[in-house]
């Protein structure tokens, strides 16, 4: 027989030879990191037909790391389903808890013993320090010193000393989240007031108000014979300016050779279409179709 078979978990006892006589026996032992559990044979014999009798390494089992219990308020998950060396043990914490230590342990061989690569981690309760205090405002539970996971506070603005109220800019409700941090930055309380939006040759059609505070929304339309240059809808933003800017109403061109500018993509269509004679491929009529429009 030629050289005997090799195995992942078993190795030959003694030095291998290039050739073996019929009836000659070779013995195996489990490799380092494996241990033997009977009854499977760990030897083979060179048979009369010059082949080795069947043998397998299935009696050699990997060394195992000790079982680790789930951490309190968490879970230990075996990545490949067994505790044999080479295994990975992943740790996760329940919602509201965070991990202290390594989130993965590896089952490793030290000499002939399988041991874990470190100490199992702990799951600690997520706690937050009080959220920031804000100028011209306050938050609920201001007397609480420690907040637990998902505990929420709501901010509100104080009454303003002047005629215009404080607006709350940002998230009014924030909660204690992962990493013991608050879900959002604290909001801001300040007076936000936009100027009265004046549009020549047009007018406001919605969002009427005494004054225009934070997030006030106004819509416009142009007079007949004028088209909107800009957006028909504007919003009062936190820096007390309109966004997009207040639009303009421009006169629709009556010249058959000059093309009227079009309104922005976000805005509405012109309130009166420019004459078709402005476009290539159309014949130019003798009389401009807009000549009799009221101003």
């Amino acid at each position: 027989c030629e050289a005997p078979p090799t195995f992942e978990a078993m190795e030959l006892i003694g030095k291998p030879k290039p050739y073996y006589r019929v009836g000659e026996r070779v013995d195996y032992k489990c490799k380092k990191g494996y241990f033997y559990i009977p009854p499977l044979a760990t030897h083979t014999i060179c048979d009369r037909n010059h082949t080795w009798l069947p043998v397998s390494d299935e009696g050699c089992y990997r060394e195992m790391c000790p079982h680790i219990r789930d951490p309190l308020n968490g879970e230990a998950i075996l990545a490949n389903g067994s505790y044999e060396f080479g295994a990975e043990l992943h740790f996760i914490c329940n919602e509201g808890y965070y991990l202290i230590g390594k989130d993965i342990l590896y089952c490793e061989l030290k000499d002939t013993v399988a041991i874990w690569s470190g100490k199992p981690p702990l799951c600690e309760k997520i706690l937050c320090t009080p959220p920031p205090k804000i100028k011209n405002g306050k938050h609920t539970f201001s007397e609480v010193e420690v907040f637990e996971y998902l505990d929420a506070v709501t901010y509100s603005c104080d009454p303003a000393p002047g005629p215009d109220p404080f607006s709350l800019i940002g998230e009014s409700m924030i909660y204690c989240g992962n990493n013991s941090t608050w879900s959002h930055a604290a909001p801001e309380c300040k007076v936000v007031k936009c100027r009265f939006p004046v549009v020549e040759n047009g007018k406001q059609i919605s969002g009427f108000g005494k004054k225009f505070y934070y997030k006030a929304t106004v819509m416009f339309e142009c007079d007949k014979g004028y088209y909107l240059n800009g957006s028909d809808k504007i919003v009062c933003e936190s820096n007390s300016t309109w966004d997009p800017p207040v639009p303009k109403c421009l006169k629709v061109s009556t010249s058959p050779t000059t093309k009227s500018p079009t309104s922005s993509a976000s805005g509405p269509r012109p309130t009166y279409k420019p004459p078709v004679s402005n476009y290539p491929g159309y014949p130019k009529p003798d009389e401009g179709i807009l000549n009799n429009l009221d101003d």
């Epitope: 100027r195 009265f196 004046v198 007018k203």
Partner: antibody, heavy 118, light 107 residues
């Protein structure tokens, strides 16, 4: 509190020109939106136009071709330039501080009289 | 331009009377209407803005109401110092325009 004082009124012949001034004291003219309004017995109160803090202007289209509003920040003064004056332009002319960016006329000057007559 | 028509053009009231002045717009102006009083020999002064909001320092015997095209200024108990000409003004659309005025006298 800013005070606005109009000046430059007087007698002018038809077809003539006149420049009215609106001087601000106790504040900067560039910090306020300034409107010009006139009043006559025959035509009542008429809004002429406004110059905004950013220097932009809006006019009453009835006067746009003849009247121009401007501002000189170094002199802390707003102006109303009136050309091609007609007899019907005879009126008391007021400059007025628009209330906080809103078209509410809360702070009127004492007015200056313009008489257009031959 | 939007026209504002005031009525009556003049009225005479006794001290303590309730006075009502109306202002009608030629088209809808939402609540974008102000009221002014011009006392004899003085410049106009703002009384009410945005239909019903009292300007600072204005006595609460003055009140405004209305919406759209029809607006009212009421003086609950007129006083001698309330004499003068009352004007309405719209600001929904340029040019901003005034009513022709209502003259209030005390009997």
């Amino acid at each position: 509190e800013v005070q606005l004082v109009e000046s430059g009124g007087g007698l002018v012949q038809p077809g003539g020109s006149l420049r009215l001034s609106c001087a601000a004291s106790g504040g900067s003219v560039s910090s306020y939106d300034i409107s010009w309004i006139r009043q006559s017995p025959s035509r009542g109160l008429e809004w002429l136009g406004v110059i905004w803090t950013d220097g932009g202007t809006n006019y009453n289209s009835a006067f746009m071709s003849r009247f121009t509003i401007s501002r000189d920040d170094s002199k802390n003064t707003a102006y109303l330039q009136m050309n091609s004056l007609k007899t019907e332009d005879t009126a008391v002319y007021y400059c007025e501080r628009v209330y906080d960016g809103y078209p509410w006329f809360a702070y009127w000057g004492q007015g200056t009289l313009v008489t257009v007559s031959s | 331009a939007i026209q504002l028509t005031q009525s009556p053009s003049s009225l005479s009231a006794s001290v303590g009377d309730r006075v009502t002045i109306t202002c009608r717009a030629s088209q809808g102006i939402s609540n974008y209407l102000n009221w002014y009083l011009q006392k004899p020999g003085q410049s106009p002064q703002l009384l009410i803005y945005y239909t019903s909001s009292l300007f600072s320092g204005v006595p609460d015997r003055f009140s405004g109401s209305g919406s759209g095209t029809d607006f009212t200024l009421k003086i609950s108990r007129v006083e001698a110092e309330d004499v003068g000409v009352y004007y309405c003004q719209q600001y929904i659309k340029l040019p901003w325009t005034f009513g022709q005025g209502t003259k209030v006298e005390i009997k």
